[in-house]
Amino acid sequence: RQQWELQGDRRCQSQLERANLRPCEQHLMQKIQRDEDSYGRDPYSPSQDPYSPSPYDRRGAGSSQHQERCCNELNEFENNQRCMCEALQQIMENQSDRLQGRQQEQQFKRELRNLPQQCGLRAPQRCDLEVESGGRDRY
């Protein structure tokens, strides 16, 4: 069993290394920024990410592309719930520095938990998405 788990971990690691989780990150950021824009947040505030949604994109244009590609990537983990959880954790960790304030972080986490379901996939049970302070990119 231990040997199998070791192989499973290794397989998951290589799957994660080949996965492109950026579309998921963009899709989620679009979602929470669209929500915030409707509450009066300045949609033209600058971003460090060259592919962060423009104000034009945030109104919904282009977002289906990020979602479609994101779902394709998550679909690769469908047979391995633990690995799916690790992918979600990686998304959370990669974006944690870009999330402004506790409220945005909670909103991002909520959307992230719903992501597999949104893609028509099984959501991993008991997947801890808490990020230790100073989370950094694993890319």
């Epitope: 080949r18 492109n20 592919y51 949604p53 994109d57 592309q65 479609e68 394709n72 469908e78």
Partner: antibody
């Protein structure tokens, strides 16, 4: 050397079938999404089909849906395109292309292409 | 499906001149999913730009890409003899992953 080599093209009658293959070498085949793209004589590029790393997501152009089937064998580093109910309009050079992405920013692109195999559908 | 329309169909210019190629989408395309390819007669396509504005490995800096939403542009600042070819834009965000019909860049 990273390489893709297509084979299986030829002359076939309308309504006939053909199976194209693409042999990959010089890279870890199972790490990449793969695509088929075709080009009719004197025309532009037309995307035909794509398949993800573990074959879990497959897409087709509307023009070939229900007639063509893409598949891959990661153990043999090969990509296939089964073409049934062929039409005159399917006459083209068929390219196999590897899809990669920019690790830091995320965009996808087809960075490695084969030289193509020619399919002629004619009575 | 997203339809990409390239213009002009043919562009006749001389070496040293500036070339501006346009790619217009029927609906918004995220920059992340806009790619440009170059193809010479009898050859397979070659990756030129991805993410709308990032040059692929080995592509000289006279090539640049810009645009967002539905309007994208490929610019070649000073044409070299080897740049005369057909150029295609492609979107790969929504299936089917469509190509534009191409712009032929020919020597005047």
């Amino acid at each position: 050397e990273v390489q893709l080599v297509e084979s299986g093209g030829g002359l076939v009658k309308p309504g006939g079938s053909l199976r194209l293959s693409c042999a990959a070498s010089g890279f870890i085949f199972s790490d990449y999404n793969m695509n088929w793209v075709r080009q009719a004589p004197g025309k532009g590029l037309e995307w035909v089909s794509s398949i993800t790393r573990s074959s879990r997501t497959i897409y087709y152009a509307d023009s070939v849906k229900g007639r063509f089937t893409i598949s891959r064998d990661n153990a043999k580093n090969s990509l296939h395109l089964q073409m049934n109910s062929l039409r005159d309009a399917d006459t083209a050079v068929y390219y196999c292309a590897r899809e990669d992405f920019d690790v830091s920013t995320g965009p996808y692109y087809m960075d490695v292409w084969g030289n193509g195999t020619t399919v002629i559908v004619s009575s | 499906e997203i339809v990409l329309t390239q213009s002009p169909g043919t562009l006749s210019l001389s070496p040293g001149e500036r070339a501006t190629l346009s790619c217009r989408a029927s609906q918004s395309v995220s920059n992340m999913f806009l790619v440009w390819y170059q193809q010479k007669p009898g050859q397979a396509p070659r990756l030129l730009m991805y993410g709308a504005s990032t040059r692929a490995t080995g592509i000289p800096d006279r090539f640049s890409g810009s645009g967002s939403g539905t309007d994208f542009t490929l610019t070649i600042s000073r044409l070299e003899p080897e740049d005369f070819a057909v150029y295609y834009c492609q979107q790969n965000g929504n299936s089917p992953y469509t190509f534009g019909q191409g712009t032929k860049l020919e020597i005047k």
